[in-house]
Amino acid sequence: AQNITARIGEPLVLKCKGAPKKPPQRLEWKLNTGRTEAWKVLSPQGGGPWDSVARVLPNGSLFLPAVGIQDEGIFRCQAMNRNGKETKSNYRVRVYQIPGKPEIVDSASELTAGVPNKVGTCVSEGSYPAGTLSWHLDGKPLVPNEKGVSVKEQTRRHPETGLFTLQSELMVTPARGGDPRPTFSCSFSPGLPRHRALRTAPIQPRVWEPVPLEEVQLVVEPEGGAVAPGGTVTLTCEVPAQPSPQIHWMKDGVPLPLPPSPVLILPEIGPQDQGTYSCVATHSSHGPQESRAVSISIIEPGEEGPTAGSVGGSGLGTLALA
């Protein structure tokens, strides 16, 4: 069969080879399409409701005034010329609709290096057949499930028109030290050959490199955090960052109701002051960062002071990113 493609809504003419140019003609068209349950036979006499879908022209050709999805299928003509010689024509008709230019929606203006980020969602509306969406980075195709690239796709079909809407959501993990302004674009490739791809306008998000934070140091005086009853303990939170962040204090994981200060003095230590202390530095640019925890304990007279090893663990590290 000869392959024929036609745009939805446009006219299509199929020639009945071997048919006399003018009536009288001995010819018959047979259609097996989305409109027919089996083979539908059309003759030059025509008439009736089928005329709006397909009618035989005076020269024997079949005329479809405005093809639709239901017209996809096989069209056959059998014609006999004046000498009684029979000729058959066989067509496979497929229809297409070019969608509007695809668009990137919900696009990110900034990506964070080293972590997965949603770049945006590419949307193509009104295609037939469905076709495909693909992403490009700096003009080169991005391959899903490679190098931190993942794609979530969705295809919907319009209940009335039968046309497709495609969506493709791109997630990437930019490499540290990579391109600070990558260029992403998306393109729609039609489901039928011979039609060129449609590409979106590009987007250029910035890539933000998170700066590794220097540790918040907690210094305790006396060293080791063991003190006799009634003694004084001084806790100092040292943060190398500039400008100086706000310092809050925690005891046993609970914030202490004190104004921000880099120094915490515990005078006249009593049993109620015993516990695990840490400080939390809050930076305007990258959120709170907690120090290691230290254990404050009371030494009863005659007891040996604890070794430095009794100081608490390494703390919680970064609590959250801004």
Partner: antibody, heavy 115, light 110 residues
């Protein structure tokens, strides 16, 4: 017999939207064909604007794509033209027609764009 | 876009003579099976009226003195013999890739 009739305002202000209705009698717009809007400028130049297919899908003249929308109301057997951000250049006689063979046209309606 | 160029822009023909109008497309509006070119007649205050569809098919109700021919990029509308009522503007139109109209030819009867 198939008949088409355009209706809508005959005067539209610049920057506003032009909205026209085509009412079809004698044939269901969901049965077949494509249903078109065509305009004719004062100098008689004809311009095809776009169509809505019997299935509901649309195609538009690329030069108008950003401003045009063709929709339909199947219960009333009507289809509609909306043209946004009009200028005086959009002054024309607007026709609706049945496509495929363009054997049937409306009588046309003159729309003037003027402040 | 396919551009259609009609010639001449106007012509005057004596009653009973032949009128020939040409339409040239900037690229082919045909396939191996057919040519997607149509011809219309328009009189003042009226919409265009279909005369010929698909290059050579006479629309029902149109007098046989109208005929169309051509393929690919070159098409012709012939009117013979011309009658008084044929004074009008004639347009070609293609439907190969979307649609465009020619600029029109005004026919005057001498």
């Amino acid at each position: 017999d198939v008949q088409l009739q355009e209706s809508g305002p005959d005067l539209v202000k610049p920057s506003q939207s032009l909205s026209l209705t085509c009412t079809v009698t004698g044939y269901s717009i969901t049965s077949g064909y494509s249903w078109h809007w065509i305009r004719q400028f004062p100098g008689n130049k004809l311009e095809w604007m776009g169509y809505i297919h019997y299935s509901g899908s649309t195609n538009y003249n690329p030069s108008l794509k950003s401003r045009i929308s063709i929709t339909r109301d199947t219960s009333k057997n009507q289809f509609f033209l909306q043209l946004n951000s009009v200028t005086t250049e959009d002054t024309a006689t607007y026709y609706c027609a049945r496509g495929g063979d363009f054997a049937y046209w409306g009588q046309g309606t003159l729309v003037t764009v003027s402040a | 876009d396919i551009v259609l160029t009609q010639s001449p822009a106007s012509l005057a023909v004596s009653l009973g003579q032949r009128a020939t109008i040409s339409c040239r497309a900037s690229k082919s509006v045909g396939t191996s099976d057919s040519s997607y070119m149509h011809w219309y007649q328009q009189k003042p205050g009226q919409p265009p009226k279909l005369l010929i569809y698909l290059a050579s098919n006479l629309e029902s109700g149109v007098p046989a003195r109208f005929s169309g021919s051509g393929s690919g990029t070159d098409f012709t509308l012939n009117i013979h013999p011309v009658e008084e009522e044929d004074a009008a503007t004639y347009y070609c139109q293609h439907s190969r890739e979307l649609y465009t109209f020619g600029g029109g030819t005004k026919l005057e009867i001498k």
